[in-house]
């Protein structure tokens, strides 16, 4: 006989089973492809000088053998002689030491003896209706199944749940889902309606996230701003890692979670583009501005809770950079140009109001003026800082004004608005007697000392009504008294205060007249 | 999406033959065993032949010796050649891919629409 052929001829050892407790047993045959089968047996005693015969009785009644010598599984193809189509017997005799051994026999149709397989390559998990589904492609040559599926977290054992009977080109499977831990799945299939059937080994783990991606414990810092009018945001605790089930250490697709960065820019709300997303790793560079900060946490199944950050401003002001010259078209501000082809955002709102109420203007594209510059110009009819108050300016510069970080601060400022001049005049001017040749003369704060960095300095200007003398004093900005000496007796005086700004110089109080009178001796 | 498409039915004379063919597309056609079963009017749909593999091939005892079924995996067709045709194989004749017992119906599970092949006395 060929010995790829089941040989019809009586085996070469005599036909005596021992009856012992050792031989063959769990025989196992399978259509392996199209054409091609496979039986598998244990063997339990010693395995030194054994022989296994596979035997084989058709439906006709007429048997035969294939000898697989000390192996314990054997092929063979549909054209070895057994029958695919009909019923077949099989058992394994095993010939040792003198004595036959027998298997249990198995009776079956070859060619629907399938080994089933578990689900392989790609298995697709989605959520439904607060489940979990798990789909595949059903194994070639494999449709109609039972599925069961077995699941644990990092603290708890193996949980076994089926999946129910599956007959099409592709499976699913309802698994439960958790909220807030991970859990490790596997799959395995076996025949539909075949009892008998053994299960298929279990598929490699499917690593699923829990519904809940965990909420980001993670805290900033924001840097001081820099020369280049921008300050960084750094990271100072990581986001907590989700626990695992053993399964799924090292490599477990499936189950990342990524955290996103989500800043939104307050200041500036006339700009194109108010929030931008980055990765959480990308620590980005920002301006002075006021910004909210949230990090998102997603897995596969979507977004779960944000923590949100307050960035306050960057309040420290440059009052020297700024000029502003008032004329009869109206205002201009000058400042040091960045450079070409820059976009400013100017923004103003008064001071000691919500930043809500926060007013801006963005230029057109601008390259500095040959003093090195950048300019901004309004009208006095379009109403910007009109009213007689004090505004916060801050001017930010972008090459980019589309890119949310690609903003920096050119520089944070205080402005008095509408008629300064006017509007910043001392009163409540009173002059009181200090000595024989002198008085302390004191005045209300101007409304230019609420503007921090506007109120240069005061004035105060004596006039001699007899030789029509004058002589002015000034006065730190933050003093509101000042003492004129050298005064004469019975001499008419009149006092005066202006308040003056850098730029602008102010107007005078009304005249206030005194005198010192003539002490007369005893 | 599975697709089974059968062609080659018509009208023949008693004792004439006809090549029936059925090409199938979404799955991999090679590794799946195929059936024909045809059903004449007012009837059930019954057996009529299997290829299991490429080469292992079974039939109803009324086509034995008639019929031959056979495929040609490069193509992903299956055929059906029948010769001496009688008024009593006059039915629509369908092909269908198998997932167990292949002499029932229940064993398959994609069916294509069908040909209608009629043989006139």
């Known amino acids: 006989c060929r010995t790829s052929e089941c040989c019809f001829q009586d085996p070469p050892y005599p036909d005596a089973d021992s009856g012992s407790a050792s031989g063959p047993r769990d025989l196992r045959c399978y259509r392996i492809s199209s054409d091609r089968y496979e039986c598998s047996w244990q063997y339990e005693g010693p395995t030194a000088g054994v022989s296994h015969f596979l035997r084989c009785c058709l439906s006709s009644g007429r048997c035969c053998y294939f000898a697989a010598g000390s192996a314990t599984r054997l092929q063979f193809s549909d054209q070895a002689g057994v029958s695919v189509l009909y019923t077949v017997t099989l058992w394994v005799e095993s010939w040792a030491r003198n004595q036959t051994e027998k298997s249990p026999e198995v009776t079956l149709q070859l060619y629907n003896s399938v080994k089933y397989e578990p689900p392989l390559g790609d298995i697709k998990v989605s959520k439904l209706a607060g489940q979990l589904r798990m789909e595949w492609e059903t194994p070639d040559n494999q449709v109609g199944a039972e599925v069961q599926f077995r699941h644990r977290t990092p603290s708890s054992p193996w949980k076994l749940g089926d999946c129910g009977p599956q007959d099409d080109d592709t499976e699913s499977c309802l698994c439960p889902l958790e909220m807030n831990v991970a859990q490790e799945f596997q799959l395995r299939r076996r025949q539909l309606g075949s009892q008998g059937s053994s299960w298929s080994k279990w598929s490699s783990p499917v690593c699923v996230p829990p519904e809940n991606p965990p909420q980001p414990q993670v805290r900033f810092s924001v840097e001081q701003l820099g020369q280049d009018g921008r300050r960084r945001l750094t990271l100072k605790e990581q986001p907590t890692q989700l626990e695992l089930p053993e399964g799924c250490q090292g490599l477990a697709p499936g189950t990342e979670v990524t955290y996103r960065l989500q800043l939104h820019m307050l200041s500036c709300p006339c700009k194109a583009k108010a929030t931008r997303t980055l990765h959480l790793g990308k620590m980005p560079y920002l301006s002075g501005a006021a910004y909210n900060v949230a990090v998102i946490s997603s897995n596969q199944f979507g977004p779960g809770l944000n923590q949100t950050w307050h960035i306050p401003a960057d309040t420290h002001t440059e009052p020297v950079a700024l000029n502003i010259s008032v004329g009869t078209n109206g205002t201009t501000m000058y400042w040091p140009a960045r450079a070409q082809s820059m976009t400013y955002c100017i923004e103003w709102q008064p001071v000691g109001q919500d930043g809500g109420l926060a007013t801006c203007s963005l230029t057109a594209p601008q390259d500095p003026d040959p003093a090195g510059m950048a300019t901004y110009s309004w009208s006095r009819e379009s109403g910007a800082m009109g009213q007689e108050k004090c505004y916060y300016i801050t001017i930010f510069a972008s090459a980019h004004p589309e890119k949310l970080t690609l903003w920096s601060t050119v520089l944070s400022t205080y402005h008095f608005g509408g008629n300064a001049s006017a509007a910043g005049t001392p009163h409540h001017v009173s002059v009181k007697n200090h000595s024989l040749d002198s008085v302390s003369v004191d005045w209300a704060p101007s409304l230019l000392s609420t503007c921090p960095g506007v109120l240069k300095e005061y004035v105060v200007r004596c006039r001699d009504e007899d030789s029509k003398q004058v002589s002015e004093h000034p006065v730190q900005p933050t003093e509101t008294q000042v003492t004129l000496s050298g005064l004469r007796a019975g001499v008419a005086y009149t006092v005066q205060v202006r308040a003056d700004t850098a730029w602008l110089r102010g107007v005078w109080s009304q005249p206030q007249r005194f005198s010192i009178e003539v002490q007369v001796s005893d | 999406e599975v697709q089974l498409v059968e062609s080659g039915g018509g009208l023949v004379t008693a004792g004439g033959s006809l090549r029936l063919s059925c090409a199938a597309s979404?799955?991999?056609?090679?590794?799946?065993?195929m059936g024909w079963f045809r059903q004449a009017p007012g009837k059930e749909r019954e057996f009529v032949a299997v290829?299991?593999?490429?080469?292992?091939?079974d039939y109803a005892d009324s086509v034995k010796g008639r019929f031959i079924i056979f495929r040609d995996n490069a193509k992903n067709t299956l055929y059906l050649q029948m010769n001496g045709l009688k008024p009593d194989d006059t039915a629509v004749y369908y092909c269908?891919?198998?997932?167990?017992?292949?002499?029932?119906?229940?064993?398959?599970?994609?069916w294509g629409q069908g040909t209608q092949v009629t043989v006139s006395s």
């Open positions: 979404g799955f991999r056609f090679s590794v799946y065993d």
């Open positions: 290829i299991v593999g490429s080469r292992t091939t």
């Open positions: 269908a891919r198998r997932v167990g017992t292949y002499e029932t119906v229940l064993g398959y599970d994609k």
